[in-house]
């Protein structure tokens, strides 16, 4: 029962993390810039994400512009796009692998092979979290570095946006969930040797005379 609970909890965390990662990927608030304007009416905030940039007026009006040309994009945004989308797709694959290895499904026959599939699902989620962490931290590092760079004027000093924090929370959930799935698979098979060897007991050898020991007979 303990291993099933770990599996369910792990899968729930991974699914929430996956949703968070999709949200972080889609949101335009990867970096934000607040511009005070001449007065409170013209005050505005500018957001920039992987796919679009938005301007939000204090009046509540929001205007977004999708990045239309791939050539105009910085290498940072292009790489962040590729890695984040890869992480989202990998999490999708990990979901099916985990479901196949789950105790409550019959895709794979119960036994060492099933445990190995479940373990693979957990490892994939762990890797997925790490993969998503790379663009998030890389992007954040650039934002922070530019913020403290004296060559960058204040009009270009962006701050970390909500999408990054959502992304970090999502990667944490994916990695914790992945660990729980791995633990569930581990517990389920009684800490097996990873090669899952099949153990045989050798048959008793007959005596040299060909007679069997009398204690074998009733």
């Amino acid at each position: 029962m303990g291993s099933a609970a770990l599996e369910i909890l792990g899968l729930v965390l991974c699914l929430v993390g996956w949703g968070g990662l999709i949200l972080a990927c889609a949101l335009p608030q990867w970096r934000i810039y607040s511009y005070a304007g001449d007065n409170i009416v013209t005050a505005q905030a500018m957001y920039e994400g992987l796919w679009m940039s938005c301007v939000s007026q204090s009046t509540g009006q929001i205007q977004c512009k999708v990045f239309d040309s791939l050539l105009n994009l910085s290498s940072t945004v292009q790489a962040a796009r590729a890695l984040t989308v890869s992480a989202v797709l990998l999490a999708f694959v990990a979901l099916f692998v985990t479901l196949a290895g789950a105790q409550c499904t019959t895709c794979v026959a119960p036994g060492p092979a099933k445990a190995r599939v479940a373990l693979t699902g957990g490892v994939l989620y762990l890797f997925c979290g790490l993969l998503a962490l790379v663009p998030l931290c890389w992007f954040a590092n650039i934002v922070v570095r530019e913020f403290y760079d004296p060559s960058v004027p204040v009009s270009q000093k962006y701050e970390l946006g909500a999408a990054l924090y959502i992304g970090w929370a999502a990667t944490a959930l994916l990695m914790v969930g992945g660990c729980l799935l791995c633990c569930g698979a581990w517990v389920c098979t009684g800490r097996p040797d990873l090669s899952f060897p099949v153990k045989y007991s050798a048959p008793r050898r007959p005596t040299a005379t060909g007679d069997y020991d009398k204690k074998n007979y009733v």
Epitope: A36, D38, S151
Partner: antibody, heavy 118, light 112 residues
Amino acid sequence: QVTLKESGPGILQPSHTLSLTCSFSGFSLNTYGVGVNWIRQPSGKGLEWLASIWWHGKTYINPSLKNRLTVSKDPSNNQAFLEVTNVDPADTATYYCAHARAQLLDYWGQGVMVTVSS
Amino acid sequence: DIVMTQTPSSQAVSAGEKVTMSCKSSQSLLYSGDQKNYLAWYQQKPGQSPKLLIYLTSTRESGVPDRFIGSGSGTDFTLTISSVQAEDLADYYCQQHYSYPLTFGSGTKLEI
């Protein structure tokens, strides 16, 4: 003590390329946070910022002259350079280089007068 | 680009008088991150290079006499010389250090 000095051709013909050198002392363009700016001032007129180059190689150029300006540096010799291609009489001015503290110009060279005339 | 507009273009004053000159920017120079206005003032005496007087609207550069006072916020800024001295004969330029391209006002010529 920070000092900067500009040097250049003084006079050149239209459509030629203007090459200016800023030789400085008292700071290094290899040091974090250091930048050199180029500014010009036509006689009796106001100041126009042209470009800046920073310790890490990043450059900013005035969009109105983007296609004609090139800035570079040689930190080992404490020099910065400005090139203006395809000059015309409107480029006649005193050209200054200045030490940058963020986007402030806190030390200026004495300036070099450049005349574009046929 | 941020356009800087200075008035008056020239001003005649007597020694000891108080003088004010104005600088307006086409957009706000207030940065919400630190609530500071990114405007500087330069003094250029005849035949000399410009010299930084004031930055961040009101912070005097070291060695600048306290008779030079900068004020303003958003888009409207003022440089005040509380008691003009003969050595203050110069052109005064405002400059926004908020964004690239850096832009200057057309200048105010102070005549004693």
